[in-house]
């Protein structure tokens, strides 16, 4: 079974800068899985942000601006990354990655 680790316990960024979060997949080939990213803002329900499928297809929450989040995966390091562009106060949240085994 697959296992996920988010090595960064926290990330502090200056407003308008870019944040990059990592999710390390083990126990399964990342290219054979779909990785999902969610965020939980303080006092709010968890929200789907973006995913990348085994075939590279990217899906995002349609209400989120197209340039806000970027998802990728690096098979060499078995890592999925979530890039948050133009960081603002509304981006303060806990970010979770999740795995769908195909």
């Amino acid at each position: 079974a697959g296992h996920l680790e988010q090595p960064q316990i926290s990330s502090t960024k200056t407003l308008s800068k870019t944040a990059r979060l990592e999710c390390v997949v083990s126990g399964i080939t990342i290219s054979a899985t779909s990785v999902y990213w969610y965020r939980e803002r303080p006092g709010e329900v968890i929200q789907f942000l973006v995913s990348i499928s085994y075939d590279g297809t990217v899906r995002k929450e349609s209400g989120i601006p197209s340039g806000k989040f970027e998802v990728d995966r690096i098979p060499e390091t078995s890592t999925s990354t979530l890039t948050i562009h133009n960081v603002e106060k509304q981006d303060i949240a806990t970010y979770y990655c999740a795995l769908w085994e195909v």
């Epitope: 075939d55 590279g56 297809t57 990217v58 899906r59 995002k60 197209s66």
Partner: nanobody
């Protein structure tokens, strides 16, 4: 609402090239991932190529990889499909499509929010 209008289709000989263009209007173009599909008579609509919202990521069906190139110009609200080394089996109606939420070969037809009316491509000697 987004309007998509394809152009550039026509009759071309085997081995020839065509450049299809899709002009978008009515909304913010960069909010949409774009793709090209084709549909031959009595066949299903098939995915050919897609380009992400920013243009930074492209995807291709195996049948056109190395022959077709997709690109987008967010300043001009257009997406293009350069088609080289055309074969008779490339004959079909070609459609562009726009999706707010999905980019890539795995997007279902239902995940595309808008479609063009199509442009005919015929490859024949």
């Amino acid at each position: 609402e987004v309007q998509l209008v394809e152009s550039g289709g026509g009759l071309v000989q085997p081995g020839g090239s065509l450049r299809l263009s899709c002009a978008a209007s009515g909304s913010i173009f960069s909010n949409y991932a774009m793709a090209w599909f084709r549909q031959a008579p009595e066949k299903e609509r098939d995915f050919l190529a897609a380009v992400s919202w920013s243009g930074g990521r492209t995807y291709y069906a195996d049948s056109v990889k190395g022959r077709f190139t997709i690109s987008r110009d967010n300043a001009k609200n257009t997406v293009n499909l350069q088609m080289n080394s055309l074969k008779p089996e490339d004959t079909a109606v070609y459609y562009c499509a726009a999706s707010l939420s999905c980019s890539g070969p795995g997007c279902s037809l239902e995940e595309y929010d808008y479609w063009g009316q199509g442009t005919q491509v015929t490859v024949s000697s």
